[in-house]
């Protein structure tokens, strides 16, 4: 495929990445799938600067990111290492809370109203943010 050098329409460019901010809600898995179909991934936050950028665009609204622990360890959807990477959890989070009574704990991470992170039930219909990197090979054939 060709290299993507500018962001698609309705996406916001920032620091060589493109971001798309939903205005509706989906379960984490559906949001994850949506981003993949756009040749992107749920947002992966790698710095305080990126955190502030995303936070500015989403406002005080629960919003999914590309971080989950559905198979045990916390994992970023693009393979970024969780252990050594940026973290911005709320105090006492993640807590894998079982008190919601929906079965299981809390396996998916989201931005809370103040931007800090919380783990929650993955089925909750939150907004989401997709991210794709500029200069990465796109899946579309080059224009002739």
């Amino acid at each position: 495929g060709s290299e993507r050098t500018c962001c698609p329409v309705n996406w916001v460019e920032h620091e060589r990445s493109c971001y798309w901010f939903s205005r509706s809600g989906k379960a984490w898995a559906d949001a994850d799938n949506y981003c993949r179909l756009e040749d992107a991934h749920l947002v992966v936050v790698t710095s305080w600067e990126e955190q502030k950028f995303v936070q500015h665009h989403i406002g005080p609204v629960n919003t999914w990111m590309g971080l989950h622990d559905q198979n045990g360890p916390w994992k970023w959807v693009d393979g970024t290492d969780y252990e050594t990477g940026f973290k911005n959890w709320r105090p006492e989070q993640p807590d894998d809370w079982y008190g919601h009574g929906l079965g299981g704990g809390e396996d998916c991470a989201h931005f809370t109203d103040d931007g800090r992170w919380n783990d929650d039930v993955c089925q909750r219909p939150y907004r989401w943010v997709c991210e794709t990197e500029l200069d990465k090979a796109s899946q579309e054939p080059p224009l002739l």
């Epitope: 916390w74 006492e92 807590d95 894998d96 809370w97």
Partner: antibody, heavy 115, light 107 residues
Framework: EVQLVESGGGLVKPGGSLRLSCAAS????????MNWVRQAPGKGLEWVSS????????YYADSVKGRFTISRDNAENSLYLQMNSLRAEDTAVYYC????????WGQGTLVTVSS | DIQMTQSPSSLSASVGDRVTITCRAS??????LAWFQQKPGKAPKSLIN???SLQSGVPSKFSGSGSGTDFTLTISSLQPEDFATYYC?????????FGPGTKVDIK
């Protein structure tokens, strides 16, 4: 590499106390729920207690409620189990394990309650 | 509390055999099920979580399936190192509960 190492087991008389420790390394301890699971000699596995990453959610098996206290020190990457009013039926190997699905286990520490 | 049962409680098999162990929950647990292998004198080792996700480093001869109340662990071709006791565990709700175990020994 994820590592969990238990210590503090030993022989104690009925009614006595013991404090188990679990030293964690190789992962961001403060991001994970931790559990204690035990296994009586020749028996199966029994979940004992769980604690969330920031101590806000704590759960106990009915068999130990009111006698055992789970705690953690995220600064020290350590998990603890304070066991009071010990009974013969508490005799077991005690394991610490990570997350609800127990994806990693320590080697265990033997607690023997006997007069 | 959710009761977990396993069948069979023990089985004898030969190297190369395909082995299937069943785990049943007394009520629905979605896919919140883990499988463990334990050898005598050793700590349990995680094989599978979320009913079918292979734990990192576990060989692909192990597979898990099921959802709701009925689950299976399959070993596609039994090897000498696989003779052990296998446990299932539900983590859908507290108290977490384990099955009684299935001992796999040499025929």
């Amino acid at each position: 590499e994820v590592q969990l190492v238990e210590s503090g087991g030993g022989l104690v008389k009925p009614g006595g106390s013991l404090r188990l420790s679990c030293a964690a390394s190789g992962f961001t301890f403060s991001s994970y729920k931790m559990n204690w699971v035990r296994q009586a000699p020749g028996k199966g596995l029994e979940w004992v207690s769980s604690i969330s990453s920031g101590n806000s959610s704590i759960y106990y098996a009915d068999s130990v409620k009111g006698r055992f206290t789970i705690s953690r020190d995220n600064a020290e990457n350590s998990l603890y189990l304070q066991m009071n009013s010990l009974r013969a039926e508490d005799t077991a190997v005690y394991y610490c394990a990570r997350v609800s699905s127990n994806d990693y286990w320590g080697q265990g520490t033997l607690v023997t309650v006997s007069s | 509390d959710i009761q977990m049962t396993q069948s069979p409680s023990s089985l004898s098999a030969s190297v190369g055999d395909r082995v299937t162990i069943t785990c049943r929950a007394s009520q629905g647990i979605s896919n919140y099920l883990a499988w463990f292998q334990q050898k005598p004198g050793k700590a349990p080792k995680s094989l599978i979580n979320a009913a079918s996700s292979l734990q990192s480093g576990v060989p692909s001869k192990f597979s898990g399936s099921g959802s709701g109340t009925d689950f299976t662990l399959t070993i596609s071709s039994l090897q000498p190192e696989d003779f052990a006791t296998y446990y299932c565990q539900q983590y859908n709700s507290f108290p977490f509960t384990f099955g009684p175990g299935t001992k796999v020994d040499i025929k």
